[in-house]
Each structure stands twice: as structure tokens, then as C-alpha cells.
């Protein structure tokens, strides 16, 4: 009600708290003398739900019943209004609309660490739109009883503060939780358990893992757990792994030894706890703690091709790469490689050390048997090396793959398809497909990539250091014991027009002919493989359409001969490229008079 | 318990603007209304706005269209924003949260309309 109504009174029956759907009969009624000019029949008493009038009446009182209120508080005002005046308020009463307490729900109870407190939570139900007090009884051994309640408004959650020992282990203690408002009280079914079940140990602390003689075979993993620990879950994984390997141990005192851990690898430990084999709940996992293991020798054997190059009449430039070892074989952090090169007759061997390289260059001369050993070394040894006689990979024409293709395969990818060599197939070991970015001149610095196929493959896809309208040497090689033959052609993963045209850098008149000589266009404006080259000309002024040469375009070629022109005429001159996609735009215009006699 | 606590009162011209805040302690309060009324000297304590615990507002005659109620559940705050003020909107302004087990009222925070 509002405070000191000094007019009037309203009162509610049959109580100001009422359960939903519940009628409720509402009464204003006037003290003597604080009508309209003290005529009762003047007074006009208005109810108000809220703002809203809902009812009306000449007199001293009114009386409403209202139905229908919405869950929550409504607030009804009782005003007088006279003639010529404004309203005036008298009086004014809430209602309260709400639920008894549903019963509360799952009660569990539980106490985090053998030093911890039991707290219960539970469920509440839905909400009652009322102040509803919770209280929490939990009775034990010996008629001993402990009682909490509380006064926070949506409350599933109380800690007694006492804590249970494990004296004596197995003895029951019960739990009920009640529910209480102005319309009803419920409560919980009682939930009966004992110091084991409800026990949650406190996460282990302070790991640390120990490797004997720096060795992932003897990794022991030591931890802290609190006393009455008797199962240990340990759980660990790479670190960019997101599968757990699983571990359970019982009495393992604060160790266990693992056995399957990988070298040179960061790993992520975290261990759980339970009191009892199958009683109670295991701890939250223990912080992470995150170890590198020891390195091990290098496992595996390095992928090892090479290149030759002719130098002069007596010396050969050998080029040597390899491909780095896998993390799972490399084994640690590889500190450099060892190359060996050894003439296999005279018996001389020559060693060095690479790092920072996955490439060697070398030269040698041309008589002689060579021979090349290259392993992987870290702090703790070296793999096994890779051993590979000098050979001229394709010296045997009979061997070289035949019908080459290389076609787009989506983005960034060649598929090369190839078929057997013509000398009995079943001699090739492997094949070899080896590509590089064409380079006009021939640049030794480009990148050299490869794979390796079984010889019963006809096919390879390429995809790795594949750039867009970019043009690639591909070579597919067929090796058999010592000798091996190949086949090259050259394609890209996606083509356009060039975008621009040669640059005609000369003519020269020679012998009643012209030689246009031109410079290549940069890599970068090829936009693909280069299929041919057009040359084209016409009578400088004329009108007429212009002749053209076709040249198929080869990766040294800058010069052509073109004798269909006649003397003493001036020729314009212009060259465009073409690829699969198209041709360029025109390269630069040159004009030219021939100055010999006519034919 | 619940503890009321108003501020922003003061001397206004007529026409101005005032906001009125009350802080309520203790979380039960998110579950009633809250209410502000005001009681002139001489007068009875009136109602003049409430606003649900879902903050549907609702205003007395004298207060609509010129008075604005709101609330921060969160803050366990209520708002009062008075615009184009009267000098018969003069008065100590309280605040109130009903409950089933009685009344908590503020202590008042005074609001003088005046040239």
C-alpha cells in the first residue's frame, strides 16, 4: 500500500499476493470529510490499473473485481475527481502475481580438493515472479545436521563451509534442498552420498617431465597430487595436433614413464585425478605444461637429383640438390649436410659441409666415374647417405619417353602424362619429372624442381612452385641402372596473350635478304608458354594488308631471315608472340629499304 | 534487505530537465517494479511512474509525455528523465521497490522548480 494515504484507503482481498489466474476483489473507500465539498454524490472514485482506468463510481467507496493479471507486480491508484478540479490521488495498493516453488531439480553436491567446502547446486524450475528463499540441509553420521539458506534472488547454488574428512570414508551423509514463498514451499528428493563420492581432487600441480641421457626413449613424467589420489588420467598430443593420446594409471605416486613420445617434438601434457575406481568424479585437467623432446639421428634418406653442364672440352659443371627431410625424419634441427664426391677408378673423394643450402655446385672433368654421397646431420648424427652415380641422364635415346604432354590441371597444377620408352619397358627403374621457370639463356640459378614416379606410372601432376602464366621446362626422365634417357616440352598451368611483342632490335641486309634480329620478351609479359613468333611487314603508306612469317618459337632463337622483300620499296616491320590463349599486341615498328638488286 | 539511494535533484528554471537516478542495493530488486512518486509540502505522497521488472513503463496523468522511466538491471539502477518542468512539479521525489514482504522506500532527493 502507499504510504500514509491521508484521503482514503484501498485494501485487497484475499491477499495482496495471489497465484496466477487467481481473482482478486479490490476496495476504495474515502475517510470521513475528504469527499467533494462534502457531497458524497459528488464524489467520482476512478480505479486505476496503472495509467489505465479500468473502473468508476459516485460515493464514498468502490469495489472492482479484477481477473486476468499477467505474472509480476500490477498497480492499482484510487483517485477522487471532483467538478472544475483535477483528479486527486488517494490511495493506491500493489498486487503481487506469481507461482509456488516447482521442486528443485537434480541436487548434486560436491567438494573441490580433500581441504575444499560442499557446495550443492540444483535446478530451480521456472521462475516463481516472487521472493523465494532456498535452504539447504545436509545431515550426517551421528544426528549431525548442518542448515544454509539463501537470500540471492535466482538461487541454485550454496556452500555449507564445512568440510567433510576422509575419517571415515564409506559414512552417508544426505542433502535436500527447499524451495519457500508467499504461495507454496517445495523440495528436493533427498540425495544420499558418502566422503568418496563427492571428493573432486584439486588438479595435480607441478609437472615436469625428465629425459634420461637426453633421450626420448627415457621420458619420465612427475607431477604432485593431493593425498588420497589413486587414479591418474594423463593425456598429451603435439602441440599442432588437436587428437589426445590417452593414458590411465593407478598409484602411480606422482610418475609414470612414456613410451611412444616422438624426437623433436613440442608436446602438450595435462593430468586428472580420482580418489576412488569408480566412485566420486576425476579433477579438472591440470594446467598444460608444454616440453620439447631431445632430438634423434636423422632417419630416412635424402631425395638427391642433379643436373650436368657441359663447360668446355674437358671440365662439366655438376649442380646437386636435395629436398629437406620431413620433421618426422629429420629428428631434430639439421645443422648442415655432407656431400662426398668421389671419382670411383682413382679412388679421390672430396668432403664438404652445406648450410643453409639445399644445393651444391661443383666442377669436374669429363673422364672419369663420379660419384655422389649427400646425408642430413644434427646434433645428434647423420641419416644414411643418399648415393647417386654421375651419369648423362639422357644419353640413351632409346629409353627417352616418348609423346610428352603437359596440360593445365585447375589452379596451379600440370598434369605431364607420358608413354614407356621403346626399349623394353620393364627395364625403367623410376621416372624422374624435373621442371623450372624458362628462362631464355638458359639462367643455372633458376630453381630446379622434381618428383619421382614408380615405372609402371604414366602421369604426374606438378603442382609445387607452380606460378600462373608462368612457363615451365619439364623434362621426364627414365632411368635404368646406369643410363637413362629423356624427353622435354614446355607447358603452364594458365595462359593469356602476351602482353607485348618482341622488340625488333636490328635489321641487316644480307645478300638481296633481311635479318630481323629482336629482343625476347621479359618473362613476366609472356603470360605463358610461347608458341610462335609472327613477323610482319608492308609498303610503308599503303593501305594494303600486311604479310606475315610464322616462326615457331624457340627459347634461343632472336634472329630470322626474310628475303621476299623488294629493293628500293620501304617496308614497315613489326613482330607480335603468340601462346595457346592468343596473340600479343605489336612490339615496337622498324622501317627498312632493301638496297640490292631486284631478282 | 534492500537500501534505496536517490540523487540528481537540485533548482531547475521552469522548462528545464532533470534526471533523477536511484540505486538499489541487493539483487532481489530485479524481479519488481520500481516506482518513483513525490510528495509536495503539505500533500500526500503521489504516485508518478513505475516500470516493470520486464521495463514496461507506465506513467500517472501528470507525468506523461513529460517524464521518462528506465532502468539497468544490471546496474540495479532506476531513471527518472524530467523535461519541461513546472514549478508545481516541486516536491521531494522518492523512490520505491514493492515487494510481497513490504515496502522499500529512498530517502527523497529534492526537486525545486523555480524563476
Known amino acids: 500500500k502507499i504510504d500514509a494515504c491521508k484521503r482514503g484507503d484501498v485494501t485487497v482481498k484475499p491477499s495482496h499476493v495471489i497465484l496466477l489466474g487467481s481473482t482478486v476483489n479490490i476496495t476504495c473507500s474515502l475517510k470521513p470529510r475528504q469527499g467533494c465539498f462534502h457531497y458524497s454524490r459528488r464524489n467520482k472514485l476512478i480505479l486505476y490499473k496503472f495509467d489505465r482506468r479500468i473502473n468508476f463510481h459516485h460515493g464514498h467507496s468502490l469495489n472492482s473485481q479484477v481477473t486476468g493479471l499477467p505474472l509480476g507486480t500490477t498497480l492499482f491508484v484510487c483517485k477522487l475527481a471532483c467538478i472544475n478540479s483535477d483528479e486527486i490521488q488517494i490511495c493506491g495498493a500493489e498486487i503481487f502475481v506469481g507461482v509456488a516453488p516447482e521442486q528443485p531439480q537434480n541436487l548434486s553436491c560436491i567438494q573441490k580438493g580433500e581441504q575444499g567446502t560442499v557446495a550443492c547446486t540444483w535446478e530451480r524450475g521456472r521462475d516463481t515472479h516472487l521472493y523465494t528463499e532456498y535452504t539447504l540441509q545436509l545431515s550426517g553420521p551421528k544426528n549431525l545436521t548442518w542448515q544454509k539458506q539463501c537470500k540471492d534472488i535466482y538461487c541454485d547454488y550454496l556452500d555449507f563451509g564445512i568440510n567433510l574428512t576422509p575419517e571415515s570414508p564409506e559414512s552417508n551423509f544426505t542433502a535436500k534442498v527447499t524451495a519457500v514463498n508467499s504461495l507454496g514451499s517445495s523440495s528436493s528428493l533427498p540425495s544420499t552420498f558418502t566422503f568418496l563420492d563427492i571428493v573432486r581432487p584439486l588438479p595435480p600441480w607441478d609437472i615436469r617431465i625428465k629425459f634420461q641421457k637426453a633421450s626420448v626413449s627415457r621420458c619420465t613424467l612427475y607431477w604432485r597430487d593431493e593425498g588420497l589420489v589413486l587414479l591418474n588420467r594423463l593425456r598429451y598430443r603435439p602441440s599442432n595436433s588437436r587428437l589426445w593420446n590417452m593414458v590411465n594409471v593407478t598409484k602411480a605416486k606422482g610418475r609414470h614413464d612414456l613410451l611412444d613420445l616422438k624426437p623433436f617434438t613440442e608436446y602438450e601434457f595435462q593430468i586428472s585425478s580420482k580418489l576412488h575406481l569408480y566412485k566420486g568424479s576425476w579433477s579438472d585437467w591440470s594446467e598444460s605444461l608444454r616440453a620439447q623432446t631431445p632430438e634423434e639421428e636423422p632417419t630416412g634418406m635424402l631425395d638427391v637429383w642433379y643436373m650436368k653442364r657441359h663447360i668446355d672440352y674437358s671440365r662439366q659443371q655438376i649442380s646437386l640438390f636435395w629436398k629437406n627431410l620431413s620433421v618426422s625424419e629429420a629428428r631434430g634441427k639439421i645443422l648442415h649436410y655432407q656431400v662426398t664426391l668421389q671419382e670411383l677408378t682413382g679412388g679421390k673423394a672430396m668432403t664438404q659441409n652445406i648450410t643453409g643450402h639445399t644445393s651444391w655446385t661443383t666442377v669436374i672433368p669429363r673422364t672419369g666415374n663420379w660419384a655422389v654421397a649427400v646425408s642430413a646431420a644434427n646434433s645428434k648424427g647423420s641419416s644414411l647417405p643418399t648415393r647417386i652415380n654421375i651419369m648423362n641422364l639422357c644419353e640413351a635415346g632409346l629409353l627417352a619417353p616418348r609423346q610428352v604432354s603437359a596440360n593445365s590441371e585447375g589452379m596451379d597444377n600440370i598434369l605431364v602424362t607420358w608413354q614407356p620408352p621403346r626399349k623394353d619397358p620393364s627395364a625403367v627403374q623410376e621416372y624422374v619429372v624435373e621442371w623450372r621457370e624458362l628462362h631464355p639463356g638458359g639462367d643455372t640459378q633458376v630453381p630446379l624442381n622434381w618428383l619421382r614416379s614408380r615405372p609402371y606410372n604414366v602421369s604426374a601432376l606438378i603442382s609445387e612452385n607452380i606460378k600462373s602464366y608462368i612457363c615451365y621446362e619439364i623434362r621426364v626422365y627414365a632411368l635404368s641402372g646406369d643410363q637413362g634417357g629423356c624427353s622435354s616440352i614446355l607447358g603452364n598451368s594458365k595462359h593469356k596473350a602476351p602482353l607485348s611483342g618482341p622488340h625488333i632490335n636490328a635489321i641487316t641486309e644480307e645478300k638481296g635478304s633481311i635479318l630481323i634480329s629482336w629482343n625476347s620478351i621479359p618473362v613476366q609479359e609472356q603470360m605463358g608458354c610461347l608458341l610462335h613468333y609472327r613477323i610482319y611487314w608492308k609498303e610503308r603508306d599503303s593501305n594494303s594488308q600486311p604479310q606475315l612469317c610464322e616462326i615457331p618459337y624457340r627459347v634461343s632463337q632472336n634472329s630470322h631471315p626474310i628475303n621476299s622483300l623488294q629493293p628500293r620499296v620501304t617496308y614497315v616491320l613489326w613482330m607480335t608472340a603468340l601462346t595457346a590463349a592468343g596473340e600479343s599486341s605489336h612490339g615496337n615498328e622498324r622501317e627498312f629499304c632493301l638496297q640490292g638488286k631486284a631478282n | 534487505q534492500v537500501q534505496l539511494q536517490e540523487s540528481g535533484g537540485g533548482l531547475v528554471q521552469p522548462g528545464g530537465s532533470l534526471r533523477l537516478s536511484c540505486t538499489a542495493s541487493?539483487?532481489?530488486?530485479?524481479?519488481?517494479?520500481m516506482d518513483w512518486y513525490r510528495q509536495a509540502p503539505g500533500n500526500q505522497r503521489e504516485w508518478v511512474a513505475s516500470?516493470?521488472?520486464?521495463?514496461?513503463?507506465y506513467y500517472d496523468g501528470s507525468a506523461k509525455g513529460r517524464f521518462t522511466i528506465s532502468r539497468d538491471n544490471a546496474k540495479m539502477t532506476v531513471y527518472l528523465q524530467m523535461n519541461s518542468l513546472r514549478p508545481e512539479d516541486t516536491a521531494v521525489y522518492y523512490c520505491?521497490?514493492?515487494?510481497?514482504?513490504?515496502?522499500?522506500w529512498g530517502q527523497g532527493t529534492q526537486v525545486t522548480v523555480s524563476s
Open positions: 541487493g539483487n532481489i530488486v530485479s524481479i519488481y517494479n
Open positions: 516500470i516493470t521488472s520486464s521495463g514496461d513503463p
Open positions: 520505491k521497490v514493492p515487494t510481497e514482504k513490504g515496502n522499500y
